[in-house]
Structures are given as structure tokens and as C-alpha cells.
Amino acid sequence: LPAQVAFTPYAPEPGSTCRLREYYDQTAQMCCSKCSPGQHAKVFCTKTSDTVCDSCEDSTYTQLWNWVPECLSCGSRCSSDQVETQACTREQNRICTCRPGWYCALSTHSGSCRQCMRLSKCGPGFGVARPGTETSDVVCKPCAPGTFSNTTSSTDICRPHQICNVVAIPGNASMDAVCTSTSPTRSMAPGAVHLPQPVSTRSQHTQPTPEPSTAPSTSFLLPMGPSPPAEGSTGD
């Protein structure tokens, strides 16, 4: 014969536990129904009647099957440095996460953030060694020789100095190298002013085909970033 299915409330067999979504009521000494997420126990069970559940009120919630007498209060509204990524409903608490450019320095058990902090910025001469995450700050490092950063940023890494045919001003940790611009002498009339052109810039070049057998003329480019290095630094 198939085993008889017990309906709540029921007295459990000695040494056995209640089934899934049931709890043991010490007062009634019976296995009783839990309330579903979004509800709470309005009336506890007795030997003859099961748990009476009721919906959570506004701004309260229960996330799990439960037999709590009152729903939990949703957390306070998100602060100005936070974004509400999950609204308060009858079944889940509000979740506040940090805005872009911020990270969570102190979080709650529910995954919400209690305290957001602005991501650190790496200044000129420093680049990002480890990017910031939702829960950790940016780590900066000094730019190694041959690399530079001329920005104050929470995302920029140290970049290599540009390669120059001829260096006008050597690069340092906070400034790219400044190159002299070279072009074939026969591409201009004698005495013509040669406008400086950045080396390997992101603009389109339309200089004529190289004439490497002729000596190039040179003109200097002014540094675009911070002031040039102190006296004593030499170019090519």
C-alpha cells in the first residue's frame, strides 16, 4: 500500500524531521506550513489548525520561506552616491550599489552597500596598476622608465614614450617625449617655414613619399603637456 501523505499540521514520527517548507512548532508540537516569500505568519498553528499567512505590508519583505510574525523592514533609500539596483518589494530588500567612479568600502549581508568611497585617481607620473572594482579601490604605481602618464585619472595606465626619429625633449614619468619633425628638404621651397608635425599622431599625414637620400630638415615641436624638464636634460 502507498504511504499515506500527512497534511499539516501533523505530529512527526519520533526521531524524524518535518518536510521541506514546514517547520516544527514547539508549542503545538506539530509540523506546520511555512509562509512563502512575501508573506509572514499572522497566526501560528495549533494541533488542529495550520499556520495562517498574510502578505507583507509596504516597505517590508520576506525573502525566504518563513514563520516570522512580522516582515523585515526594507533598508533606507539609497544615498546620493548610490544607485538603486534592486527595488524594495514584498519578496526582496532594496539593494544600493555605488555609482560609477565609486566603490563599496562597507557592504551589508544582503549585498547592499553601506558606505561608498570615490575611486582614487592616479596623478601625473602615476598609472593604474590595478583597476578599481565594485568593492576595491584603484591601486596606482609610479610610471617606470620609458613610460609616462600626464593625466589625473582612475583608469589611465602608464603609456610608453613615443619613438622619435630625433628627440627634441626626452620623455619623463609625467610627459611624453617630444620629437623633432623631419621631412624631405625637396618637399619645400628654399627658406620655407616648416610647420611642426607630431610624430605618429592620430591625424592623417599627407607628406610626400620619403626621399631618404636627402638630408632632412628639422623643426621643433613644443611640448603639449606639463612644462618641459629642468635644465640639464638633453635631446638628441
Epitope: V166, V167, V199, S200, P212, S213, A215
Partner: antibody, heavy 120, light 112 residues
């Protein structure tokens, strides 16, 4: 006519050293960045190192940094690559190349190449 | 793996037009840096074919042309000839690396 002629390649054991040379002619050597580019057997091109025209600034690929040293002698129109602590993966044909006019990130002239074999 | 991506092979018959692509990223081609193309005939050193996206050095036939858009570039060869059978490499500057970066190369075969 621009000419670049490499020499100094050969067979060397792992951990050994080799010095490559590149003799240049036909252009104002000191006005241009010079590069070394390598090509492993049956593989593609890989930039290795560069040096500015006046030899004040050097540049290296991460794969050779600390092991290779690029230099030049403008009075002799010669480019060098000193290769130390050589590894099997350094086996390649090494080309010297001249930086382009106004933009040293392209190479308008290449040498014929010299083969470096690192093997025990 | 190369920083710039090229198809490993391409083919065409004499007289045809063939295009070879070169795809980069926001730190190289997409950053606005110029793309250069090299031709390497079997057993020889590479030779500059196209510089600064679309410029031809003297001596390079006008059958070869280059273009660039967004994060990619392409080399077009029209009126394909048997002597065009070679490896073709694209190259560009990259923000995060000291020197230029190359594509893996495309082996062009002229059929027939």
C-alpha cells in the same frame, strides 16, 4: 641608394650572447630612428627594439627587455644589438630597419636579415 | 597571438581584385594611428608597400591601395599578377606597447 647590411648572426647555446651589427649607407643615419625586427622560422614579424637618431633614447619589446641592448655609432653609420641570456624562442632572422620619414613607426627600408639560432 | 588580426590566407586568379583585412582595437587602429603594409616575397626581406594608411612609396604599382576605417584597415590588390604571391603584413602603433605591432600575416596565393 639606401642600404642596410646585417651581420653577426650564427649558432649560440641557450644562455649565450651574440652581437648583431647593421651597416647603413645612402641616408643621413643620425636623423632617423633605427629598429630591429625579427621573424622566427615560418612565423610572422615581431618588433624587437628601436633607438632614436641621436642614440639618447632606446625602446624594447617586453619579450627582450633586460636581455637585449640596442646601440648605434653615428660616426660609423652602424646599428648594434647586443643579445644576452639567449633563449630557444629568440631563434629568428633578425632584420634591421630604418624608421620612416616623419613617422618612425613604419620602416621604409629593411636589411636582408641575419639568422640567429639558439640551440644546444 | 598577434595584436592585429589578419586572415591567414587569401587567393585569387590573375587579373582579379583581392582584399586583405587587418582588424585592430581602440588602442591601435581605433585610436587613430596610421596603418602600414609590408610585402614579403618568398625567401626575401619585407618591403614597405603602403604607409600612413594609403600612401605608396615610389616604385610601388598603383594596383596596390590601402584604406582605413574605425578599428580596421584593408589592402586591395587589383589586376592580380603571379609575382604578387607573397606574405602581406599590416602594422600600426599601439598605445600600450613601446613599438609598432604587426598582424599575423596573410599568405596570398595566385591561382592558375
Amino acid at each position: 641608394e639606401v642600404q642596410l647590411l646585417e651581420s653577426g648572426g650564427g649558432l649560440v647555446q641557450p644562455g649565450g650572447s651574440l652581437r648583431l651589427s647593421c651597416a647603413a649607407s645612402g641616408f643621413t643615419f643620425s636623423s632617423y630612428a633605427m629598429h630591429w625586427v625579427r621573424q622566427a622560422p615560418g612565423k610572422g614579424l615581431e618588433w624587437v627594439s628601436a633607438i632614436s637618431g641621436g642614440a639618447t633614447t632606446t625602446y624594447y619589446a617586453d619579450s627582450v627587455k633586460g636581455r637585449f641592448t640596442i646601440s648605434r655609432d653615428n660616426s660609423k653609420n652602424t646599428l648594434y644589438l647586443q643579445m644576452n641570456s639567449l633563449r630557444a624562442e629568440d631563434t629568428a632572422v633578425y632584420y634591421c630597419a630604418k624608421g620612416g620619414t616623419g613617422d618612425p613607426y613604419y620602416f621604409d627600408y629593411w636589411g636582408q636579415g641575419t639568422l640567429v639560432t639558439v640551440s644546444s | 597571438q598577434s595584436v592585429l588580426t589578419q586572415p591567414p590566407s587569401a587567393s585569387g586568379t590573375p587579373g582579379q581584385r583581392v582584399t586583405i583585412s587587418c582588424t585592430g582595437s581602440s588602442s591601435n587602429i581605433g585610436a587613430g594611428y596610421d596603418v602600414h603594409w609590408y610585402q614579403q616575397l618568398p625567401g626575401t626581406a619585407p618591403k614597405l608597400l603602403i604607409y600612413r594608411n594609403n600612401q605608396r612609396p615610389s616604385g610601388v604599382p598603383d594596383r596596390f591601395s590601402g584604406s582605413k576605417s574605425g578599428t580596421s584597415a584593408s589592402l586591395a590588390i587589383s589586376g592580380l599578377r603571379s609575382e604578387d604571391e607573397a606574405d602581406y603584413y599590416c602594422a600600426a602603433r599601439d598605445d600600450g606597447l613601446s613599438g609598432p605591432v604587426f598582424g599575423g600575416g596573410t599568405k596570398l596565393t595566385v591561382l592558375g
